[in-house]
């Protein structure tokens, strides 16, 4: 039998064992988080699958993910939301220690999809393990990009109190308007619920005394946030290694001096 013709995309294909991975992650998450015990993981997988299976992978909409978003509804306590941009690993290390703060990937839907790739094909029930659309080279309305845009928007919309964001001080654009944080989350914080955004600018491994809160891109972020009637604060984290160490052991005498 000749293999059926399959669309060739520029991006890597669906992560191997994708359905099993999503289902296993869901089961694990609901076991660890008592408030999500009511979630039926088979229904979650069905809703996830329904968002992209049999659909042309360059024509996915936020609407496609609404059934999944509904099943994964979760709230973060006020003052406990941590957003991040281009510095995922440190943000996750932080919330692993500071257990009462949450990134999107600490929530069910973010946890399910973190580091995974997926896409289907128009008019077939197959998952494409060979290739998926690349955001730049193929299209932006692909299953993965639309998923993260959808859940990031929701995560920002539900945030309240003081929201924190971790930004990478080693990038040329510390705040990048084209990142998910800059293009989605910033614009979906609700001024009636969010009093302030506090940016933590994480310095690279090299020692430095410069105040990166004075960076032009941070000033741009401040301007965007202030125009939305949300207060803005910025802190330099000069020593990320010490920062994490002091989150773990705040009583440590060396934590009285700067981080």
């Amino acid at each position: 039998v000749l293999p059926r013709w399959r669309q060739q995309w520029s991006g890597s294909g669906t992560t191997s064992r994708f359905p099993e991975t999503v289902l296993a992650r869901c089961v694990k998450y609901t076991e660890v988080h008592p408030e999500m015990r009511h979630v039926d993981c088979q229904s979650v997988w069905d809703a996830f699958k329904g968002a992209f299976i049999s659909k042309y992978p360059c024509n996915i909409t936020e609407e496609d993910y609404q059934p999944l978003v509904k099943l994964g509804t979760q709230t973060v306590p006020c003052n406990k939301t941590l957003l991040w941009s281009r510095i995922k690993d440190l943000a996750h290390q932080f919330t692993q220690v500071q257990r009462d703060m949450f990134t999107l990937e600490d929530m069910l839907l973010g946890y399910l999809a973190d580091d995974l790739t997926w896409c289907g094909e128009f008019n077939t029930f197959e998952i494409n393990y060979q290739s998926c659309p690349d955001w730049r080279k193929d299209c932006s309305n692909n299953p993965v990009s639309v998923f993260w845009k959808t859940v990031s928007r929701r995560f920002a919309e539900t945030a309240c109190g003081v929201v924190h964001v971790m930004l990478n001080g080693s990038r040329s654009k510390i705040f990048d308007k084209n990142s998910t944080f800059g293009s989605v989350e910033v614009h979906n914080l609700q001024p009636e619920k969010v009093q302030a955004l506090e940016a933590w600018v994480i310095h690279g491994g090299r020692e430095d005394s410069r105040d990166l809160c004075q960076d032009p891109t941070i000033k741009e972020l401040e301007s965007i946030i202030s125009k939305r009637n949300i207060r803005f604060f910025c802190k330099n984290i000069y020593r990320p290694d010490k920062f994490l160490q002091c989150v773990k052991n705040p009583e440590d005498s060396s934590c009285l001096s700067g981080i």
Partner: antibody, heavy 119, light 112 residues
């Protein structure tokens, strides 16, 4: 040994511009080390103009020099540049480039470029 | 901007003597990252400055141990335990705790 080599002296008339260069012979550290420019005027001591981190092009200027100086760097030739505009006699000085040795510490200095502005 | 004030302006010393130069900043140089970015440079006639001491008390590579630095907050001192002929020149303190980096006016070390 010479680590930073600066361009030769420049004589300019008021109102003109000049672009000074500073070649770093340590190609490994150049992209990821801030390069500062400092000027020394007789009787005025040293003034920090600004610095640039070549690999990402991040620049800090001293407030006094924001409209006077333009910093640039080329990571292919490992060369930093300082352009001075609207020159006046007040800008006559020796201009040094200095690469940081550790974070925020000027450890290695070029030999300096004398800029003389005269009608 | 932080103002760095050095004293004395001129310091005549005999070879083998101890020399002491003071540097005072207009505000504390203790940075929020826990470091104090106060440094000392020597500029010999016709040459560019050379780093001697960084972050108050650390000798830069190749700097003889007769040079030492001390101080905290706003008051700092450079000591040369036994002055040699090659030590003559102008000594500058500098801070890089707060932008813009600023420099002291210099202290000229000369033979008595």
């Amino acid at each position: 040994q010479v680590q930073l080599q600066q361009s030769v002296s420049e004589l300019r008339s008021p109102g003109s511009s000049v672009k000074l260069s500073c070649k770093d012979f340590d190609s490994e550290v150049f992209p990821t080390s801030y390069m500062s420019w400092v000027r020394q005027k007789p009787g005025h001591g040293f003034e920090w103009i600004g610095d640039i981190l070549p690999n990402i092009g991040r620049i800090f200027y001293g407030e006094k020099f924001e409209d006077k100086a333009k910093l640039d760097a080329d990571t292919v030739s490992n060369t930093a540049y300082l352009e001075l505009t609207s020159l006046s006699s007040e800008d006559s000085a020796i201009y040094y480039c200095a690469r940081e040795a550790y974070g925020s510490i000027l450890g290695y200095w070029g030999q300096g470029t004398l800029v003389a502005v005269s009608a | 901007d932080i103002v760095m004030t050095q004293t004395p302006l001129s310091l005549p010393v005999g070879l083998g003597d101890q020399a002491s130069i003071s540097c005072r900043s207009s505000q504390s140089l203790l940075h929020s990252n826990g470091n104090t970015y106060l440094h000392w440079y020597l500029q010999k006639p016709g040459q560019s400055p050379k780093l001697l001491i960084y972050k108050v008390s650390n000798r830069f590579s190749g700097v003889p141990d007769r040079f030492s630095g001390s101080g905290s907050g706003t008051d700092f001192t450079l000591k040369i335990s036994r002055v040699e002929a090659e030590d003559l020149g102008v000594y500058f303190c500098s801070q890089s705790s707060h932008l813009p980096w600023t420099f002291g006016g210099g202290t000229k070390l000369e033979i008595k």
